[in-house]
């Protein structure tokens, strides 16, 4: 079925929401004054070998649990991430974007990445897909 302008618009909005969530996480933790940043950087994330289509979001979905675990370290009184809620929201968006019709087996790169590299990769992915839709 060819995508309609309304479905394209919906996809774009969902990607923009995902992008904002990922940027919010990155901005919240990637601050040189963050006392826990060096320890957060000891956690390793799997990166997709290829991320050019919405189906590749399967690779992001599979890393959401480890992401939540690291975000549990990122809270402060003035920065309420509420990791469980945030990851749940991202999960809903990812599921809708990648679709559940086809089962895609994610292929990961050999090298693991830090949380900062991981977030930047998926931010770049989201921006790239959005640019093809607009």
């Amino acid at each position: 079925m060819a995508p309609t302008s309304s479905s394209t618009k919906k996809t774009q909005l969902q990607l923009e929401h995902l992008l904002l969530d990922l940027q919010m996480i990155l901005n919240g933790i990637n601050n040189y004054k963050n006392p826990k940043l060096t320890r957060m950087l000891t956690f390793k994330f799997y990166m997709p070998k290829k991320a050019t289509e919405l189906k590749h979001l399967q690779c992001l979905e599979e890393e959401l649990k480890p992401l939540e675990e690291v975000l549990n370290l990122a809270q402060s009184k003035n920065f309420h991430l509420r990791p469980r809620d945030l990851i749940s929201n991202i999960n809903v968006i990812v599921l809708e974007l990648k679709g559940s019709e086809t089962t895609f087996m994610c292929e990961y790169a050999d090298e693991t990445a830090t949380i900062v590299e991981f977030l930047n990769r998926w931010i770049t992915f989201s921006q790239s897909i959005i640019s093809t839709l607009t």
């Epitope: 006392p35 000891t42 956690f43 390793k44």
Partner: antibody, heavy 121, light 111 residues
């Protein structure tokens, strides 16, 4: 009971290698980072470095970078601190400790009993 | 690295005394409203034991006679009524910036 049990005292000669251990029990070992702290005779505490047993990721105090290696074997819930060539100045008590960093905090809540390392010719 | 200066470095006290130990940081150890300053007790031949975390939170199982206060660069550990088992060395630690650093220690001896 949550505990960290360290290997026994060591007496070594300068130039020798050494690997001491810290075994965690009573909790999910890969869910917490392990820190290493040095205490030279009659002195205070110095933080050396940290390891994430789940990923193997490490971070060192610049003072100890290149002097020691921190590693872990998650299959046996054990973290290690090792030297390739000991010096007399490495004589000290070495502690491992569990890092807690959820929420708004960051502290060492459980400590090993310590391993005494004596380096003398 | 952040330097922590404890005072006094040692002193004598009697059981029942109210004891106050101070820890001064070379720069603020606060981040977004939280103080990353902890207190530990160490007895001879033993490992340090956590007493207070985040400046004022009492670790589970630690007697309520221990309390902590302060923010920014100035912190205090107070023992409201010194008991015989409290004679030990006390260390403050900052966990706001790497490398984590400890104060030089304050030894509390029997008068």
């Amino acid at each position: 009971e949550v505990q960290l049990v360290q290997s026994g005292a060591e007496v070594k000669k300068p130039g020798e290698s050494l690997k001491i251990s810290c075994k965690g029990s009573g909790y999910a070992f890969t869910n917490y980072l392990i820190e290493w702290v040095r205490q030279m005779p009659g002195k205070g505490l110095e933080w050396m470095g940290v390891i994430n047993p789940g990923s193997g990721g490490t971070y060192y105090n610049e003072k100890f970078k290149g002097q020691v290696t921190i590693s872990a074997d998650k299959s046996i819930s054990t973290a290690y601190l090792q030297w390739s060539s000991l010096k007399a100045s490495d004589t000290a008590m070495y502690y491992c400790a569990r890092w807690r960093g959820e929420g708004y905090y960051a502290y060492f809540d459980v400590w090993g009993q310590g391993t005494t390392v004596t380096v003398s010719s | 690295a952040i330097r922590l200066t404890q005072s006094p470095s040692s002193f004598s006290a009697s059981t029942g005394d109210r004891v106050t130990i101070t820890c001064k940081a070379s720069q603020s150890v606060d981040y977004q409203g939280d103080s990353y300053l902890n207190w530990y007790q160490q007895k001879p031949g033993k490992a340090p034991k956590l007493l207070i975390y985040s400046a004022s939170n009492l670790e589970s199982g630690v007697p309520s006679r221990f309390s902590g206060s302060g923010s920014g660069t100035d912190f205090t550990l107070t023992i409201s009524s010194l008991q015989s088992e409290d004679f030990a060395t006390y260390y403050c630690q900052q966990s706001n910036e790497d490398p984590y650093t400890f104060g030089g220690g304050t030894k509390v001896e029997i008068k």
